[in-house]
Interface confidence: low
Protein backbone atom coordinates (compact mmCIF):
# COMPACT_ATOMS: atom_id res chain seq x y z
CA UNK A 1 0.00 0.00 0.00
CA UNK A 2 1.50 3.33 -1.04
CA UNK A 3 1.80 5.83 1.80
CA UNK A 4 0.26 9.18 0.92
CA UNK A 5 1.88 12.03 2.88
CA UNK A 6 -0.70 13.49 5.23
CA UNK A 7 -2.47 16.63 4.09
CA UNK A 8 -3.08 19.50 6.46
CA UNK A 9 -6.65 20.01 7.55
CA UNK A 10 -7.48 23.60 6.56
CA UNK A 11 -6.19 26.26 8.93
CA UNK A 12 -8.77 28.48 10.59
CA UNK A 13 -8.44 31.85 8.90
CA UNK A 14 -10.61 34.63 7.53
CA UNK A 15 -10.36 37.95 5.76
CA UNK A 16 -13.25 40.35 6.23
CA UNK A 17 -13.75 43.72 4.61
CA UNK A 18 -15.52 46.79 5.93
CA UNK A 19 -16.49 49.94 4.02
CA UNK A 20 -18.64 51.57 6.70
CA UNK A 21 -18.53 52.10 10.46
CA UNK A 22 -21.33 53.45 12.65
CA UNK A 23 -20.67 55.91 15.49
CA UNK A 24 -21.13 54.38 18.97
CA UNK A 25 -21.44 50.97 17.29
CA UNK A 26 -19.07 49.05 15.09
CA UNK A 27 -18.00 48.38 11.52
CA UNK A 28 -20.15 46.43 9.08
CA UNK A 29 -17.99 43.42 8.15
CA UNK A 30 -18.45 41.15 5.15
CA UNK A 31 -16.47 38.12 4.07
CA UNK A 32 -15.79 38.34 0.31
CA UNK A 33 -15.03 34.62 -0.06
CA UNK A 34 -17.28 31.62 0.48
CA UNK A 35 -14.23 29.44 1.16
CA UNK A 36 -13.28 31.00 4.50
CA UNK A 37 -12.74 28.50 7.32
CA UNK A 38 -14.13 30.92 9.91
CA UNK A 39 -17.57 32.49 9.99
CA UNK A 40 -19.12 35.92 10.50
CA UNK A 41 -22.25 36.14 12.63
CA UNK A 42 -24.03 39.27 13.92
CA UNK A 43 -21.14 41.43 12.69
CA UNK A 44 -18.59 39.41 14.69
CA UNK A 45 -16.01 36.81 13.73
CA UNK A 46 -16.70 33.57 15.57
CA UNK A 47 -13.74 31.82 17.23
CA UNK A 48 -14.02 28.02 17.27
CA UNK A 49 -10.41 27.05 18.01
CA UNK A 50 -8.27 27.89 21.03
CA UNK A 51 -4.83 29.31 20.36
CA UNK A 52 -2.77 32.23 19.20
CA UNK A 53 -4.08 34.25 16.26
CA UNK A 54 -2.19 36.55 13.95
CA UNK A 55 -4.36 39.64 13.44
CA UNK A 56 -3.93 42.24 10.71
CA UNK A 57 -6.05 45.39 10.62
CA UNK A 58 -6.00 48.04 7.88
CA UNK A 59 -8.15 50.94 6.75
CA UNK A 60 -8.45 54.63 5.88
CA UNK A 61 -11.35 56.45 7.52
CA UNK A 62 -13.37 59.39 6.18
CA UNK A 63 -13.01 61.19 9.50
CA UNK A 64 -11.09 61.01 12.75
CA UNK A 65 -12.31 58.26 15.06
CA UNK A 66 -11.41 56.08 17.99
CA UNK A 67 -11.53 52.38 17.20
CA UNK A 68 -11.22 49.26 19.33
CA UNK A 69 -11.29 45.59 18.41
CA UNK A 70 -12.77 43.39 21.14
CA UNK A 71 -12.98 39.63 21.62
CA UNK A 72 -14.73 39.07 24.95
CA UNK A 73 -17.00 41.05 27.24
CA UNK A 74 -15.12 42.40 30.26
CA UNK A 75 -11.72 41.98 28.63
CA UNK A 76 -9.46 44.70 27.23
CA UNK A 77 -9.36 45.25 23.47
CA UNK A 78 -7.07 43.46 21.00
CA UNK A 79 -6.35 46.82 19.39
CA UNK A 80 -7.23 50.28 20.60
CA UNK A 81 -6.55 53.36 18.50
CA UNK A 82 -7.45 56.85 19.61
CA UNK A 83 -8.29 59.72 17.25
CA UNK A 84 -6.90 58.20 14.05
CA UNK A 85 -7.77 58.54 10.38
CA UNK A 86 -6.04 55.33 9.35
CA UNK A 87 -4.81 52.04 10.77
CA UNK A 88 -2.20 49.51 9.59
CA UNK A 89 -1.44 47.24 12.53
CA UNK A 90 -0.44 43.66 13.21
CA UNK A 91 -0.81 41.82 16.49
CA UNK A 92 -0.82 38.41 18.12
CA UNK A 93 -3.45 37.38 20.66
CA UNK A 94 -4.65 34.25 22.42
CA UNK A 95 -8.31 33.60 21.64
CA UNK A 96 -10.56 30.71 22.64
CA UNK A 97 -13.74 28.88 21.66
CA UNK A 98 -16.79 31.13 22.19
CA UNK A 99 -14.85 34.37 21.70
CA UNK A 100 -16.24 36.81 19.15
CA UNK A 101 -14.11 39.48 17.46
CA UNK A 102 -15.95 42.73 16.82
CA UNK A 103 -15.40 46.47 16.44
CA UNK A 104 -16.37 49.41 18.58
CA UNK A 105 -16.10 52.87 17.07
CA UNK A 106 -16.48 56.39 18.44
CA UNK A 107 -16.25 59.57 16.44
CA UNK A 108 -16.02 63.03 17.95
CA UNK A 109 -17.89 64.80 15.18
CA UNK A 110 -21.19 66.53 15.81
CA UNK A 111 -22.74 64.86 12.78
CA UNK A 112 -24.11 61.37 13.15
CA UNK A 113 -23.26 60.22 9.65
CA UNK A 114 -21.62 56.87 9.08
CA UNK A 115 -17.86 56.80 8.67
CA UNK A 116 -16.75 55.64 5.23
CA UNK A 117 -13.75 53.31 5.05
CA UNK A 118 -11.30 52.75 2.19
CA UNK A 119 -9.33 49.50 2.15
CA UNK A 120 -10.90 48.32 5.39
CA UNK A 121 -9.60 44.80 6.02
CA UNK A 122 -9.34 42.54 9.05
CA UNK A 123 -7.48 39.22 8.80
CA UNK A 124 -7.35 36.50 11.48
CA UNK A 125 -5.10 33.45 11.09
CA UNK A 126 -4.98 30.66 13.67
CA UNK A 127 -1.41 29.81 14.70
CA UNK A 128 -2.03 26.64 16.76
CA UNK A 129 -3.59 23.93 14.64
CA UNK A 130 -3.74 20.73 16.65
CA UNK A 131 -5.23 22.52 19.62
CA UNK A 132 -8.81 22.37 20.86
CA UNK A 133 -11.54 23.21 18.35
CA UNK A 134 -15.33 23.09 18.73
CA UNK A 135 -17.22 23.47 15.44
CA UNK B 1 -10.91 0.56 7.94
CA UNK B 2 -12.16 4.16 8.18
CA UNK B 3 -9.51 6.74 7.40
CA UNK B 4 -9.27 9.38 10.14
CA UNK B 5 -7.97 12.68 8.76
CA UNK B 6 -4.59 13.40 10.33
CA UNK B 7 -4.51 15.85 13.19
CA UNK B 8 -1.77 18.42 13.57
CA UNK B 9 0.88 17.65 16.17
CA UNK B 10 0.96 20.64 18.54
CA UNK B 11 2.82 23.68 17.28
CA UNK B 12 5.76 24.92 19.34
CA UNK B 13 4.55 28.13 20.97
CA UNK B 14 4.71 29.92 24.29
CA UNK B 15 3.45 33.04 26.01
CA UNK B 16 5.50 34.29 28.93
CA UNK B 17 4.71 37.20 31.21
CA UNK B 18 7.07 39.53 33.02
CA UNK B 19 6.24 42.06 35.73
CA UNK B 20 9.79 42.97 36.74
CA UNK B 21 13.12 43.69 35.06
CA UNK B 22 16.48 44.10 36.75
CA UNK B 23 18.95 46.78 35.66
CA UNK B 24 22.02 45.40 33.87
CA UNK B 25 20.29 41.98 33.84
CA UNK B 26 17.03 40.89 32.33
CA UNK B 27 13.34 40.43 32.91
CA UNK B 28 11.94 37.73 35.19
CA UNK B 29 9.75 35.61 32.91
CA UNK B 30 7.03 33.19 33.95
CA UNK B 31 4.78 31.00 31.87
CA UNK B 32 1.19 31.27 33.15
CA UNK B 33 0.04 28.05 31.46
CA UNK B 34 1.15 24.48 32.10
CA UNK B 35 0.09 23.53 28.58
CA UNK B 36 2.79 25.45 26.74
CA UNK B 37 4.71 23.43 24.14
CA UNK B 38 7.94 25.33 24.87
CA UNK B 39 9.80 25.63 28.15
CA UNK B 40 11.39 28.34 30.28
CA UNK B 41 14.74 27.56 31.92
CA UNK B 42 17.09 29.95 33.77
CA UNK B 43 14.96 32.90 32.68
CA UNK B 44 15.30 31.98 29.01
CA UNK B 45 12.93 30.39 26.50
CA UNK B 46 14.48 27.21 25.15
CA UNK B 47 14.36 26.67 21.38
CA UNK B 48 14.05 23.02 20.34
CA UNK B 49 12.91 23.39 16.73
CA UNK B 50 14.69 25.05 13.81
CA UNK B 51 12.68 27.52 11.78
CA UNK B 52 11.07 30.92 11.59
CA UNK B 53 9.34 32.22 14.70
CA UNK B 54 6.73 34.91 15.00
CA UNK B 55 7.69 37.04 18.00
CA UNK B 56 5.41 39.49 19.80
CA UNK B 57 6.71 41.71 22.60
CA UNK B 58 4.59 44.07 24.71
CA UNK B 59 4.95 46.00 27.95
CA UNK B 60 4.76 49.31 29.80
CA UNK B 61 7.77 50.09 31.99
CA UNK B 62 7.90 52.07 35.23
CA UNK B 63 10.87 54.07 33.94
CA UNK B 64 12.81 54.72 30.77
CA UNK B 65 15.07 51.83 29.78
CA UNK B 66 16.95 50.25 26.93
CA UNK B 67 15.85 46.70 26.22
CA UNK B 68 17.23 43.99 23.95
CA UNK B 69 15.97 40.48 23.27
CA UNK B 70 18.80 38.05 22.48
CA UNK B 71 18.86 34.48 21.19
CA UNK B 72 22.52 33.51 20.88
CA UNK B 73 25.82 34.73 22.30
CA UNK B 74 27.77 36.81 19.81
CA UNK B 75 24.73 37.48 17.62
CA UNK B 76 22.82 40.72 17.33
CA UNK B 77 19.52 41.09 19.17
CA UNK B 78 16.08 40.04 17.88
CA UNK B 79 14.73 43.36 19.14
CA UNK B 80 16.61 46.37 20.40
CA UNK B 81 14.83 49.39 21.84
CA UNK B 82 16.66 52.42 23.13
CA UNK B 83 15.31 54.74 25.85
CA UNK B 84 11.68 53.59 25.80
CA UNK B 85 8.90 53.43 28.37
CA UNK B 86 6.79 50.97 26.40
CA UNK B 87 7.07 48.37 23.67
CA UNK B 88 4.54 46.84 21.27
CA UNK B 89 6.51 45.12 18.52
CA UNK B 90 6.20 42.14 16.22
CA UNK B 91 9.03 40.45 14.37
CA UNK B 92 10.02 37.33 12.49
CA UNK B 93 13.34 35.58 13.10
CA UNK B 94 15.04 32.31 12.25
CA UNK B 95 15.96 30.42 15.41
CA UNK B 96 17.51 26.98 15.86
CA UNK B 97 17.89 24.13 18.33
CA UNK B 98 20.05 25.21 21.29
CA UNK B 99 19.12 28.89 20.99
CA UNK B 100 17.82 30.58 24.12
CA UNK B 101 15.68 33.72 24.04
CA UNK B 102 16.38 36.12 26.90
CA UNK B 103 16.23 39.80 27.84
CA UNK B 104 18.94 42.32 28.58
CA UNK B 105 17.91 45.59 30.20
CA UNK B 106 19.71 48.83 31.00
CA UNK B 107 18.24 51.79 32.82
CA UNK B 108 19.90 55.17 33.10
CA UNK B 109 18.51 56.02 36.50
CA UNK B 110 20.77 56.56 39.49
CA UNK B 111 18.60 54.30 41.62
CA UNK B 112 19.14 50.56 41.42
CA UNK B 113 15.54 49.60 41.99
CA UNK B 114 13.88 47.00 39.79
CA UNK B 115 11.81 48.24 36.88
CA UNK B 116 8.12 47.36 37.22
CA UNK B 117 6.30 46.20 34.10
CA UNK B 118 2.60 46.38 33.26
CA UNK B 119 1.27 44.01 30.62
CA UNK B 120 4.69 42.52 29.99
CA UNK B 121 4.20 39.71 27.48
CA UNK B 122 6.47 37.82 25.10
CA UNK B 123 4.97 35.36 22.63
CA UNK B 124 6.93 32.98 20.37
CA UNK B 125 5.17 30.88 17.71
CA UNK B 126 7.03 28.43 15.49
CA UNK B 127 6.17 28.90 11.81
CA UNK B 128 7.87 25.82 10.31
CA UNK B 129 6.39 22.65 11.74
CA UNK B 130 7.85 19.68 9.90
CA UNK B 131 11.38 20.99 10.26
CA UNK B 132 14.10 19.67 12.57
CA UNK B 133 13.27 19.43 16.27
CA UNK B 134 15.34 18.01 19.14
CA UNK B 135 13.48 17.55 22.41
CA UNK C 1 1.18 -1.90 13.49
CA UNK C 2 2.48 1.05 15.51
CA UNK C 3 0.78 4.34 14.67
CA UNK C 4 3.32 7.05 13.86
CA UNK C 5 1.91 10.52 14.51
CA UNK C 6 1.64 12.38 11.21
CA UNK C 7 4.46 14.75 10.40
CA UNK C 8 3.84 18.11 8.84
CA UNK C 9 4.81 18.37 5.20
CA UNK C 10 7.25 21.29 5.05
CA UNK C 11 5.65 24.73 5.16
CA UNK C 12 6.25 27.01 2.17
CA UNK C 13 8.65 29.64 3.42
CA UNK C 14 11.74 31.50 2.26
CA UNK C 15 14.25 34.05 3.46
CA UNK C 16 16.05 36.06 0.78
CA UNK C 17 18.80 38.59 1.27
CA UNK C 18 19.62 41.66 -0.78
CA UNK C 19 22.70 43.86 -0.59
CA UNK C 20 22.11 45.97 -3.70
CA UNK C 21 19.18 47.72 -5.38
CA UNK C 22 19.15 49.33 -8.82
CA UNK C 23 17.45 52.67 -9.43
CA UNK C 24 14.26 52.39 -11.51
CA UNK C 25 14.55 48.61 -11.19
CA UNK C 26 14.57 46.37 -8.16
CA UNK C 27 16.73 44.68 -5.57
CA UNK C 28 19.01 41.76 -6.38
CA UNK C 29 17.73 38.92 -4.18
CA UNK C 30 19.60 35.76 -3.23
CA UNK C 31 18.51 32.85 -1.07
CA UNK C 32 21.34 31.95 1.34
CA UNK C 33 19.97 28.45 2.03
CA UNK C 34 19.53 25.52 -0.32
CA UNK C 35 16.81 24.10 1.92
CA UNK C 36 14.19 26.76 1.22
CA UNK C 37 10.77 25.43 0.25
CA UNK C 38 10.14 28.35 -2.14
CA UNK C 39 12.17 29.39 -5.14
CA UNK C 40 13.68 32.56 -6.60
CA UNK C 41 13.44 33.06 -10.36
CA UNK C 42 14.31 36.20 -12.37
CA UNK C 43 14.76 38.17 -9.18
CA UNK C 44 11.25 37.29 -7.98
CA UNK C 45 9.93 34.87 -5.35
CA UNK C 46 7.59 32.36 -6.99
CA UNK C 47 4.26 31.67 -5.25
CA UNK C 48 3.00 28.10 -5.67
CA UNK C 49 0.43 27.93 -2.88
CA UNK C 50 -2.72 29.99 -2.40
CA UNK C 51 -3.24 31.54 1.00
CA UNK C 52 -2.20 34.16 3.49
CA UNK C 53 1.51 34.91 3.81
CA UNK C 54 3.34 36.53 6.68
CA UNK C 55 5.81 38.98 5.15
CA UNK C 56 8.78 40.55 6.93
CA UNK C 57 10.93 43.19 5.24
CA UNK C 58 14.08 44.76 6.70
CA UNK C 59 17.02 46.80 5.49
CA UNK C 60 19.19 49.91 5.81
CA UNK C 61 19.80 51.73 2.53
CA UNK C 62 22.83 53.75 1.51
CA UNK C 63 20.64 56.58 0.33
CA UNK C 64 17.09 57.77 0.57
CA UNK C 65 14.75 55.86 -1.77
CA UNK C 66 11.16 54.92 -2.48
CA UNK C 67 10.55 51.18 -2.38
CA UNK C 68 7.58 49.01 -3.27
CA UNK C 69 7.08 45.27 -3.05
CA UNK C 70 4.74 43.93 -5.75
CA UNK C 71 3.10 40.55 -6.31
CA UNK C 72 1.01 40.90 -9.46
CA UNK C 73 0.90 43.24 -12.46
CA UNK C 74 -1.93 45.74 -12.19
CA UNK C 75 -2.34 45.25 -8.44
CA UNK C 76 -1.27 47.60 -5.69
CA UNK C 77 1.94 46.89 -3.78
CA UNK C 78 2.26 44.69 -0.67
CA UNK C 79 4.44 47.40 0.87
CA UNK C 80 5.08 50.93 -0.31
CA UNK C 81 7.59 53.20 1.44
CA UNK C 82 8.35 56.74 0.33
CA UNK C 83 11.60 58.62 1.03
CA UNK C 84 13.08 56.16 3.53
CA UNK C 85 16.60 55.13 4.45
CA UNK C 86 15.51 52.04 6.35
CA UNK C 87 12.63 49.60 6.57
CA UNK C 88 11.49 47.20 9.29
CA UNK C 89 7.94 46.16 8.47
CA UNK C 90 5.66 43.18 8.87
CA UNK C 91 2.50 42.49 6.91
CA UNK C 92 -0.03 39.84 5.97
CA UNK C 93 -1.28 39.37 2.41
CA UNK C 94 -3.26 36.86 0.39
CA UNK C 95 -1.17 35.52 -2.49
CA UNK C 96 -1.97 32.85 -5.06
CA UNK C 97 -0.37 30.39 -7.46
CA UNK C 98 1.38 32.26 -10.31
CA UNK C 99 2.04 35.39 -8.22
CA UNK C 100 5.61 36.65 -8.14
CA UNK C 101 6.95 38.85 -5.35
CA UNK C 102 9.47 41.45 -6.53
CA UNK C 103 10.85 44.89 -5.68
CA UNK C 104 10.60 48.22 -7.43
CA UNK C 105 12.95 50.98 -6.32
CA UNK C 106 13.24 54.68 -7.16
CA UNK C 107 15.90 57.05 -5.90
CA UNK C 108 15.87 60.78 -6.45
CA UNK C 109 19.63 61.16 -6.58
CA UNK C 110 21.46 62.68 -9.50
CA UNK C 111 23.93 59.76 -9.59
CA UNK C 112 22.95 56.46 -11.16
CA UNK C 113 25.01 54.24 -8.92
CA UNK C 114 23.46 51.22 -7.22
CA UNK C 115 22.01 51.58 -3.75
CA UNK C 116 23.88 49.51 -1.19
CA UNK C 117 21.82 47.69 1.46
CA UNK C 118 22.85 46.57 4.94
CA UNK C 119 20.82 43.80 6.55
CA UNK C 120 18.46 43.54 3.57
CA UNK C 121 16.11 40.64 4.29
CA UNK C 122 12.71 39.57 2.97
CA UNK C 123 10.89 36.64 4.60
CA UNK C 124 7.69 34.99 3.32
CA UNK C 125 5.90 32.31 5.35
CA UNK C 126 2.75 30.57 4.11
CA UNK C 127 -0.01 30.59 6.73
CA UNK C 128 -2.54 28.23 5.08
CA UNK C 129 -1.04 24.77 4.62
CA UNK C 130 -3.75 22.43 3.39
CA UNK C 131 -4.86 24.90 0.75
CA UNK C 132 -4.30 24.67 -3.01
CA UNK C 133 -0.69 24.30 -4.22
CA UNK C 134 0.66 23.79 -7.74
CA UNK C 135 4.32 22.77 -7.91
Amino acid sequence: LQQVPPQYPPIQSIRVQFTRCENEKGCIITSPSKDETMKVQDNSIIINCDGFYLISLKGYFSEELSLSLYYRKGRGPLFSLSKVTSVDSIGVAYLAFKDKVYFNVTTHSTSYKDIQVNGGELILIHQNPGGFCAY
Amino acid sequence: LQQVPPQYPPIQSIRVQFTRCENEKGCIITSPSKDETMKVQDNSIIINCDGFYLISLKGYFSEELSLSLYYRKGRGPLFSLSKVTSVDSIGVAYLAFKDKVYFNVTTHSTSYKDIQVNGGELILIHQNPGGFCAY
Amino acid sequence: LQQVPPQYPPIQSIRVQFTRCENEKGCIITSPSKDETMKVQDNSIIINCDGFYLISLKGYFSEELSLSLYYRKGRGPLFSLSKVTSVDSIGVAYLAFKDKVYFNVTTHSTSYKDIQVNGGELILIHQNPGGFCAY
Epitope: - | L81, S82, H108 | E63, H108, T110, S111
Partner: antibody, heavy 118, light 107 residues
Framework: EVQLVESGGDLVKPGGSLRLSCVAS????????MNWVRQAPGKGLHWVAF????????SYEDTVQGRFTISRDYAKNTLYLQMNSLRAEDTAVYYC???????????WGQGTLVTVSS | SYVLTQLPSVSVTLRQTAHITCGGD??????VYWYQQKLGQAPVMIIY???NRPTGIPERFSGASSGNTATLTISGSLAEDEADYYC??????????FGGGTHLTVL
Amino acid sequence: EVQLVESGGDLVKPGGSLRLSCVASGFTFNTYHMNWVRQAPGKGLHWVAFINSGGSGTSYEDTVQGRFTISRDYAKNTLYLQMNSLRAEDTAVYYCACGSIWTHFDYWGQGTLVTVSS
Amino acid sequence: SYVLTQLPSVSVTLRQTAHITCGGDIIGSKSVYWYQQKLGQAPVMIIYRDNNRPTGIPERFSGASSGNTATLTISGSLAEDEADYYCQVWDSRTQALFGGGTHLTVL
Protein backbone atom coordinates in the same frame (compact mmCIF):
# COMPACT_ATOMS: atom_id res chain seq x y z
CA GLU D 1 21.55 61.13 29.66
CA VAL D 2 23.29 60.55 26.32
CA GLN D 3 26.97 61.47 26.45
CA LEU D 4 29.64 61.33 23.76
CA VAL D 5 33.19 62.20 24.83
CA GLU D 6 35.89 62.53 22.17
CA SER D 7 39.62 62.28 22.82
CA GLY D 8 42.88 61.75 20.95
CA GLY D 9 43.17 65.12 19.25
CA ASP D 10 46.72 66.48 19.04
CA LEU D 11 49.28 68.41 17.02
CA VAL D 12 50.75 66.13 14.34
CA LYS D 13 53.07 66.61 11.37
CA PRO D 14 51.82 66.17 7.76
CA GLY D 15 51.98 62.50 6.77
CA GLY D 16 51.53 61.44 10.38
CA SER D 17 48.81 59.32 12.02
CA LEU D 18 46.35 59.78 14.85
CA ARG D 19 43.55 57.73 16.39
CA LEU D 20 40.50 59.52 17.77
CA SER D 21 38.18 57.86 20.29
CA CYS D 22 34.60 58.61 21.27
CA VAL D 23 33.24 56.96 24.42
CA ALA D 24 29.44 56.64 24.43
CA SER D 25 27.21 56.37 27.49
CA GLY D 26 23.55 56.81 28.38
CA PHE D 27 22.19 54.75 25.49
CA THR D 28 22.40 51.27 24.00
CA PHE D 29 25.51 51.60 21.86
CA ASN D 30 24.73 48.69 19.54
CA THR D 31 21.43 50.23 18.39
CA TYR D 32 22.84 53.54 17.16
CA HIS D 33 24.59 54.48 13.93
CA MET D 34 27.70 56.63 14.44
CA ASN D 35 29.39 59.40 12.46
CA TRP D 36 32.45 61.61 12.56
CA VAL D 37 31.94 65.25 11.49
CA ARG D 38 34.68 67.88 11.39
CA GLN D 39 34.76 71.66 11.44
CA ALA D 40 37.82 73.57 10.27
CA PRO D 41 38.55 76.78 12.23
CA GLY D 42 35.96 79.43 11.32
CA LYS D 43 34.33 77.13 8.74
CA GLY D 44 31.19 75.02 8.43
CA LEU D 45 30.39 71.42 9.33
CA HIS D 46 31.83 68.72 7.12
CA TRP D 47 30.82 65.06 7.36
CA VAL D 48 33.75 62.61 7.43
CA ALA D 49 32.65 59.00 8.04
CA PHE D 50 29.74 56.77 9.00
CA ILE D 51 29.41 53.28 10.54
CA ASN D 52 26.07 51.53 10.97
CA SER D 53 24.75 50.08 14.24
CA GLY D 54 25.94 46.55 13.52
CA GLY D 55 29.36 47.63 12.28
CA SER D 56 28.85 45.96 8.91
CA GLY D 57 28.48 49.13 6.84
CA THR D 58 30.83 52.10 6.54
CA SER D 59 31.11 55.08 4.23
CA TYR D 60 33.52 57.99 3.88
CA GLU D 61 33.77 61.48 2.44
CA ASP D 62 35.75 61.42 -0.82
CA THR D 63 38.83 63.28 0.45
CA VAL D 64 39.40 60.88 3.37
CA GLN D 65 38.56 57.62 1.57
CA GLY D 66 41.55 55.26 1.87
CA ARG D 67 43.25 57.37 4.54
CA PHE D 68 40.71 57.24 7.39
CA THR D 69 39.07 54.18 8.94
CA ILE D 70 35.99 54.27 11.16
CA SER D 71 35.38 51.38 13.58
CA ARG D 72 33.58 50.58 16.83
CA ASP D 73 34.21 48.41 19.87
CA TYR D 74 30.95 47.19 21.41
CA ALA D 75 32.61 45.90 24.59
CA LYS D 76 34.06 49.35 25.29
CA ASN D 77 31.12 51.40 23.91
CA THR D 78 33.70 53.28 21.87
CA LEU D 79 33.84 54.69 18.36
CA TYR D 80 37.22 55.19 16.66
CA LEU D 81 38.63 57.13 13.74
CA GLN D 82 42.05 55.99 12.58
CA MET D 83 43.59 58.83 10.54
CA ASN D 84 46.65 58.13 8.38
CA SER D 85 48.58 60.26 5.86
CA LEU D 86 47.31 63.42 7.53
CA ARG D 87 47.30 66.70 5.58
CA ALA D 88 47.17 70.36 6.63
CA GLU D 89 43.58 70.53 5.35
CA ASP D 90 42.55 67.85 7.88
CA THR D 91 43.04 70.43 10.66
CA ALA D 92 39.67 70.76 12.42
CA VAL D 93 37.60 70.05 15.48
CA TYR D 94 36.34 66.46 15.10
CA TYR D 95 32.91 65.66 16.51
CA CYS D 96 31.40 62.22 16.93
CA ALA D 97 27.62 62.10 16.46
CA CYS D 98 25.15 59.27 16.85
CA GLY D 99 21.73 58.63 15.39
CA SER D 100 18.95 56.15 15.93
CA ILE D 101 18.10 56.19 12.22
CA TRP D 102 20.71 56.35 9.48
CA THR D 103 19.90 59.90 8.51
CA HIS D 104 19.94 61.48 11.99
CA PHE D 105 22.75 63.18 13.87
CA ASP D 106 20.70 63.08 17.07
CA TYR D 107 23.46 63.67 19.61
CA TRP D 108 26.92 65.24 19.33
CA GLY D 109 30.04 65.24 21.47
CA GLN D 110 31.91 68.42 22.34
CA GLY D 111 34.69 67.71 19.86
CA THR D 112 38.46 67.17 19.89
CA LEU D 113 40.96 69.41 18.05
CA VAL D 114 43.32 67.93 15.46
CA THR D 115 46.08 70.22 14.17
CA VAL D 116 48.24 69.10 11.23
CA SER D 117 51.23 71.38 10.86
CA SER D 118 54.98 71.14 10.36
CA SER E 1 28.41 65.87 -6.77
CA TYR E 2 25.44 67.30 -4.85
CA VAL E 3 25.72 70.83 -3.43
CA LEU E 4 23.65 72.58 -0.75
CA THR E 5 23.64 76.37 -0.94
CA GLN E 6 22.93 78.64 2.05
CA LEU E 7 23.18 82.41 2.40
CA PRO E 8 26.15 83.25 4.68
CA SER E 9 24.08 85.54 6.89
CA VAL E 10 20.50 86.54 7.68
CA SER E 11 19.29 89.27 10.04
CA VAL E 12 15.97 89.44 11.87
CA THR E 13 14.43 91.91 14.30
CA LEU E 14 13.67 90.58 17.77
CA ARG E 15 10.34 88.72 17.87
CA GLN E 16 9.98 88.81 14.08
CA THR E 17 10.03 85.78 11.78
CA ALA E 18 13.30 84.57 10.26
CA HIS E 19 13.51 82.45 7.11
CA ILE E 20 16.73 80.54 6.42
CA THR E 21 16.89 78.79 3.05
CA CYS E 22 18.84 75.84 1.72
CA GLY E 23 19.03 75.28 -2.04
CA GLY E 24 19.72 72.00 -3.78
CA ASP E 25 18.70 70.21 -6.96
CA ILE E 26 15.23 68.66 -6.32
CA ILE E 27 15.89 68.93 -2.57
CA GLY E 28 12.15 68.39 -2.06
CA SER E 29 12.66 64.74 -2.97
CA LYS E 30 15.18 64.29 -0.15
CA SER E 31 14.76 64.49 3.60
CA VAL E 32 16.28 67.66 5.04
CA TYR E 33 17.73 68.08 8.55
CA TRP E 34 18.60 71.34 10.32
CA TYR E 35 21.18 71.94 13.04
CA GLN E 36 21.82 74.93 15.28
CA GLN E 37 25.35 75.69 16.48
CA LYS E 38 25.97 78.40 19.03
CA LEU E 39 29.43 79.93 19.41
CA GLY E 40 31.88 77.50 21.01
CA GLN E 41 29.29 74.70 21.31
CA ALA E 42 28.50 71.44 19.53
CA PRO E 43 25.67 71.42 16.98
CA VAL E 44 22.13 70.48 18.04
CA MET E 45 19.54 68.91 15.72
CA ILE E 46 16.46 71.13 15.60
CA ILE E 47 14.51 69.70 12.63
CA TYR E 48 14.56 66.19 11.15
CA ARG E 49 12.96 64.80 8.00
CA ASP E 50 11.87 68.19 6.63
CA ASN E 51 9.47 69.35 9.33
CA ASN E 52 9.74 67.30 12.54
CA ARG E 53 10.96 68.76 15.83
CA PRO E 54 12.92 66.63 18.31
CA THR E 55 11.74 66.65 21.93
CA GLY E 56 12.76 69.84 23.71
CA ILE E 57 13.03 72.02 20.60
CA PRO E 58 10.71 75.05 20.88
CA GLU E 59 7.63 75.24 18.63
CA ARG E 60 8.86 78.45 17.04
CA PHE E 61 11.22 76.33 14.89
CA SER E 62 9.61 74.74 11.84
CA GLY E 63 10.77 73.35 8.51
CA ALA E 64 9.44 72.90 4.99
CA SER E 65 10.86 71.55 1.77
CA SER E 66 9.70 71.43 -1.86
CA GLY E 67 11.18 71.80 -5.31
CA ASN E 68 14.72 73.09 -5.07
CA THR E 69 14.43 74.87 -1.71
CA ALA E 70 14.18 73.86 1.93
CA THR E 71 13.31 76.50 4.50
CA LEU E 72 13.84 76.77 8.24
CA THR E 73 11.41 79.23 9.82
CA ILE E 74 11.87 80.77 13.26
CA SER E 75 8.63 82.48 14.34
CA GLY E 76 9.17 85.16 16.95
CA SER E 77 12.96 85.08 17.01
CA LEU E 78 14.64 85.51 20.37
CA ALA E 79 18.15 86.75 21.22
CA GLU E 80 19.07 83.17 22.19
CA ASP E 81 18.38 82.05 18.60
CA GLU E 82 21.46 83.93 17.36
CA ALA E 83 23.64 81.10 16.01
CA ASP E 84 24.85 79.31 12.88
CA TYR E 85 22.27 77.11 11.15
CA TYR E 86 23.17 74.20 8.88
CA CYS E 87 20.97 72.16 6.57
CA GLN E 88 21.91 68.56 5.80
CA VAL E 89 20.86 65.76 3.45
CA TRP E 90 22.26 62.39 2.51
CA ASP E 91 23.49 62.41 -1.06
CA SER E 92 23.54 59.61 -3.57
CA ARG E 93 26.79 58.00 -2.45
CA THR E 94 25.92 57.07 1.13
CA GLN E 95 27.43 60.35 2.16
CA ALA E 96 26.04 63.06 4.41
CA LEU E 97 26.25 66.56 3.07
CA PHE E 98 25.97 69.83 5.02
CA GLY E 99 25.20 73.27 3.65
CA GLY E 100 27.78 76.00 4.17
CA GLY E 101 25.81 77.42 7.09
CA THR E 102 23.88 80.63 7.73
CA HIS E 103 24.65 82.97 10.63
CA LEU E 104 21.47 84.40 12.10
CA THR E 105 21.77 87.80 13.76
CA VAL E 106 18.90 88.91 15.99
CA LEU E 107 18.69 92.70 16.06
